[in-house]
């Protein structure tokens, strides 16, 4: 019987962003079936009109596939027939934000679901110790961020404290001219204290820690993306 | 059935502007873009251009950048392709046509003369 | 901007000749790669889309390969109403240029 005899399938995908010039991932899992030639896959994005990708009776289906996506989509089809439709985006551009939406029809029926991708760049701090500046220094680089961040510096020892009058941040644009460099200095800073730099947009949130002791420098950092959710 | 339906001839001066326009019917007006394409006499066809219906966002051929504007009309399910400062190299049929990565169905064209 | 060459640019044939035209593209294009055919004082009519997909209400006499730079039009039997002149276009990336035609006349 046709497509509009079947009942609906559970499609789920998942929120996420993606960093400019790398690969991303696009989440979508639904309910399997037990015959791949049965499952169709596709991926669409709104104001687009061609579509971001199709697979079909096995295999990539892209007559229709819209130009900002060429040779940038792939599905993962060895995982098709377990139920995963995750779209691997290649060299994510900032245009690729978006709403987009997962596809799905199997032999038990069709569904789809929707899915937020936000863009940008975002990277993992580096807190050293400025040696060449007159006084005890620490200055935080980041290569790589987009849309403009904003950097505090907190301190385990002074905790609340607020650091901006004896901060100094800049932004420099990368050769591409989108994504920036961030830099930021703290001045006078003590010994024997562990302080943070803290580099957050509306995409992600970066931390670089540093440890100054007499003996030794500690150095920890983490990145986290913001609002990613089911 | 789908039909494009285009605007009769226009004879311009040097200098002048043109404003052609497209109207669709018998599919979803803001499903698939739409392309301008020119061909002056006895010669090949040349890439002018699209529009997103949907968006209105447009792409133009490089040579035609700063001539060149498309516009859409989604209470009409029209597109108006303008160019200005027209060149006696301008004269050429000019069709519009459907698609997404081929065109299909075209206009009938509408011929611009441009001459003093 | 990606470059089509087509060839030849005109061909004389007689009702009932097999013949090709063909185009190769100044990159690789996949298979976004599309026919039109053009009778003078008419617009162009798609013949084939994504290089061998023949187009609903044409003729099966033509059929279109290849793949990657290099590709065909085949008509398999000349018929009459076939005599026209056939362009190729790439649709892989904007702008989405045109062969510079093939004008195909009777012998």
């Known amino acids: 019987f046709g497509i509009s005899g079947r009942h609906s399938i559970t499609v789920t995908t998942v929120a996420s962003a993606g960093n400019i010039g790398e690969d991303g991932i696009l989440s979508c899992t639904f309910e399997p079936d037990i015959k791949l030639s049965d499952i169709v896959i596709q991926w669409l994005k709104e104001g687009v009109l061609g579509l971001v990708h199709e697979f079909k009776e096995g295999k990539d289906e892209l007559s229709e596939q819209d130009e900002m996506f060429r040779g940038r989509t792939a599905v993962f089809a060895d995982q098709v027939i377990v139920g995963n439709a995750s779209l691997r985006l290649k060299n994510v551009q900032l245009t690729d934000a978006g709403t987009y939406k997962c596809y799905i029809i199997t032999s038990k029926g069709k569904g789809n679901a929707n899915l937020e991708y936000k863009t940008g760049a975002f990277s993992m701090p580096e807190v050293n110790v400025d040696y060449n500046a007159s006084s005890e220094t620490l200055r935080c680089e980041a290569p790589r961020w987009f849309p403009q961040p904003t950097v505090v510096w907190a301190s385990q020892v002074d905790q609340g404290a607020n650091f901006s009058e004896v901060s100094n941040t800049s932004f420099e644009l990368n050769s591409e001219n989108v994504t920036m460099k961030v830099v930021s200095v703290l001045y006078n800073v003590t010994i024997n204290n562990t302080y943070s730099c803290m580099i957050e947009n509306d995409i992600a949130k970066a931390t670089g820690d540093i440890k100054v002791t007499e003996s030794e420098i500690k150095r920890r950092s983490h990145l986290q993306l913001l609002n990613s959710k089911a | 059935q789908v039909q494009l339906v285009q605007s009769g001839a226009e004879v311009k001066k040097p200098g002048a502007s043109v404003k052609v326009s497209c109207k669709a019917s018998g599919y979803t007006f803001t499903a698939q873009y739409m392309y301008w394409v020119r061909q002056a006499p006895g010669q090949g066809l040349e890439w002018m251009g699209r529009i997103n219906p949907t968006s209105g966002n447009t792409v133009y051929a490089q040579k035609l950048q700063g001539r060149v504007t498309m516009t859409r009309d989604t209470s009409t399910s029209t597109v108006y392709m303008e160019l200005s400062s027209l060149r006696s190299e301008d004269t050429a049929v000019y069709y519009c046509?459907?698609?997404?990565?081929?065109?299909?169905?075209w206009g009938q064209g509408t011929l611009v003369t441009v001459s003093s | 901007d990606i470059q089509m060459t087509q060839s030849p640019s005109s061909l004389s044939a007689s009702v009932g000749d097999r013949v090709t035209i063909t185009c190769q593209a100044s990159q690789d294009i996949s298979n976004y790669i599309n026919w039109y055919q053009q009778k003078p004082g008419k617009a162009p009519k798609l013949l084939i889309y994504a290089a061998s997909r023949l187009q609903s209400g044409v003729p099966s006499r033509f059929s279109g390969s290849g793949s990657g730079t290099d590709f065909t039009l085949t008509i398999s039997s000349l018929q009459p109403e076939d005599f026209a002149t056939y362009y190729c276009q790439q649709s892989y990336r904007s702008p989405f240029t045109f062969g510079q035609g093939t004008k195909l006349e009777i012998k």
């Open positions: 046509a459907r698609g997404i990565n081929w065109f299909d169905p």
